[in-house]
Interface confidence: low
């Protein structure tokens, strides 16, 4: 059994171009054409000087996180595909990315995937409409706003002037006036004005698989939900925020562990 092993299979890295808004997760897929027996898979970003900076790695059944925990590598169940994700992408994450595989001894080989480009765009405050509003209309709205504010200011100034004039002309009439409401009639809230308190659960990982040796890290975005529980009526402790984001769900079984062969 001493003949050389088959040559290393090519890598693919997709999509070739990916655009996400800042704050969203950006996910590339690095795919092996074959399942190698022993290998290391690295995820790189190309620096401006065309050098590769390692972001994270996958070695055997262990994920090796990089310095920045936002960069995550997840092996998919088929064993050939790896999700390489940037959690909450930032504008300066825009750039060129690739994956590289090192096939371990006895026949050490190194292979790099084609490059892929990530563009992280600025998050807009409003979701874009189907047909963008024409600029003149926006100008008209702005103009209306300016006129409205100006009118209110002029009105207030006129009211103050009138009050001053009245005070000057009828000094006695204003001295004993009471400007507060009746003591036995406090200011009322509307009939449905029960205060609303929110308990922000932050990021909840709804997962069901058992623990694996990998260092804890949140799972893929599609397994994450955001929950805000609203309690109308009287609160137990008003204004208190409880976070359950530390309730870390388990990671999917690593490839060394086989497909669900740990019946614990």
């Amino acid at each position: 059994l001493d003949s050389p092993d088959r040559p290393w299979s090519p890598l693919t890295f997709s999509p070739a171009q990916l655009t996400v808004q800042e704050g969203e997760n950006a996910t590339f897929t690095c795919s092996l054409a074959d399942i190698p027996d022993s290998f290391v898979l690295n995820w790189y970003r190309l620096s401006p000087r065309n050098q590769t900076d390692k972001l994270a790695a996958f070695q055997e059944d262990r994920i090796e996180p990089g310095r920045d925990r936002r960069f995550r590598v997840t092996r998919l169940p088929n064993g050939r595909d790896f999700h390489m994700s940037i959690v909450a992408a930032r504008l300066n994450d825009s750039g060129i990315y690739l994956c590289g595989a090192i096939y371990l001894p006895p026949n050490t080989q190194i292979n790099e995937s084609p490059r892929a480009e990530l563009s992280v765009t600025e998050r807009t405050l409003e979701p874009p409409t189907q047909s963008p509003s024409p600029p003149p209309r926006l100008s008209g709205q702005l103009q209306g706003l300016v006129i409205g504010v100006t009118s209110v200011l002029v009105g207030v100034l006129l009211l103050l002037l009138l009050t001053w004039v009245l005070a000057a002309v009828f000094p006695r009439a204003t001295r004993g006036a009471c400007v507060c409401g009746s003591e036995d009639e406090p200011l009322k809230e509307g009939p449905d004005a029960a205060p609303v308190f929110t308990l922000d659960y932050g990021e909840l990982d709804f997962q069901w698989r058992e623990k694996t040796p990998e260092p804890p890290a949140p799972c893929a975005p599609e397994q994450t939900e955001y929950a805000t529980i609203v309690f109308p009526g009287r609160p137990a402790s008003p204004g208190r925020r409880a976070s359950a984001s530390s309730l870390q769900g388990a990671q999917p079984p690593s490839p060394e562990d086989g497909p669900g062969l740990w019946p614990l």
Partner: antibody, heavy 119, light 112 residues
Framework: EVQLVESGGDLVKPAGSLRLSCLAS????????MSWVRQAPEKGLHLVAG????????YYKDAVKGRFTISRDNAKSIVYLQMNSLRVEDTAMYYC????????????WGQGTLVTVSS | DVVMTQTPLSLSVSPGETASISCKAS???????????LTWFRQKPGQSPHRLVY???HRHPGVPDRFSGSGSGTDFTLRISRVEADDTGLYYC?????????FGAGTKVELK
């Protein structure tokens, strides 16, 4: 080169105990789950126990549950199989195997250590 | 338990010929992830088993391409083309998807 060297096999009386050891070299031991597979004389192969890379999850064949304990010392690159309440039917060659995997497990085996349970 | 049935139990081949070993599983070895978890081993007298093929058709590093695995679901075959003297031994198939893992009884391959 991946090497797995078992030791600790012996002749023992029923209800006795033994501890098998497997010293691993030639690979990053702490990255791999490990298994023990046994083969009775002139018989087939049977998975006995498995342990994940961190040592916090284990698997046992029904016939050995409660009697055998698999453990590991990643600092020393050793995996152990503690065998208590041994029975005659536990007589077999015990192999230490790298991995507990459908992708790349069971790829490397030790030379085996013989356990004989007899009165 | 999943029963792995190997045929034939023994096989005598001439050097240079092709040897075929069949393995049938009592249940499908196709996992929901799309992979089929069948492994082939060879054991020589007085030695430990050595993996030849995993996941039906993936050769273990260093295994010559004369060894090829095929099949799907429950029926699998290991073919050894251009048989050499060193190919003799006991060949096992094994499934690593259903708990507990189970192995075939073995096929003894010898030279004519």
């Amino acid at each position: 080169e991946v090497q797995l060297v078992e030791s600790g096999g012996d002749l023992v009386k029923p209800a006795g105990s033994l501890r098998l050891s497997c010293l691993a070299s030639g690979f990053t031991f702490s990255s791999y789950s490990m298994s023990w597979v046994r083969q009775a004389p002139e018989k087939g192969l049977h998975l006995v126990a498995g342990i994940n890379s961190d040592g916090d999850r284990t698997y046992y064949k029904d016939a050995v549950k409660g009697r055998f304990t698999i453990s590991r010392d990643n600092a020393k690159s050793i995996v152990y199989l503690q065998m208590n309440s041994l029975r005659v039917e536990d007589t077999a060659m015990y192999y230490c195997v790298r991995g507990f995997s459908s992708f790349n497990g069971l790829g490397y085996w030790g030379q085996g250590t013989l356990v004989t349970v007899s009165s | 338990d999943v029963v792995m049935t190997q045929t034939p139990l023994s096989l005598s081949v001439s050097p240079g010929e092709t040897a075929s070993i069949s393995c049938k599983a009592s249940q499908s070895l196709l996992h929901s992830d799309g992979n089929t978890y069948l492994t082939w081993f060879r054991q020589k007298p007085g030695q430990s088993p050595h993996r030849l093929v995993y996941a039906v058709s993936h050769r273990h590093p260093g295994v010559p391409d004369r060894f090829s695995g095929s099949g799907s679901g429950t029926d699998f075959t290991l073919r050894i083309s251009r048989v050499e003297a060193d190919d003799t031994g006991l060949y096992y198939c094994g499934q690593v998807i259903h708990d507990p893992w189970t192995f075939g009884a073995g096929t003894k391959v010898e030279l004519k």
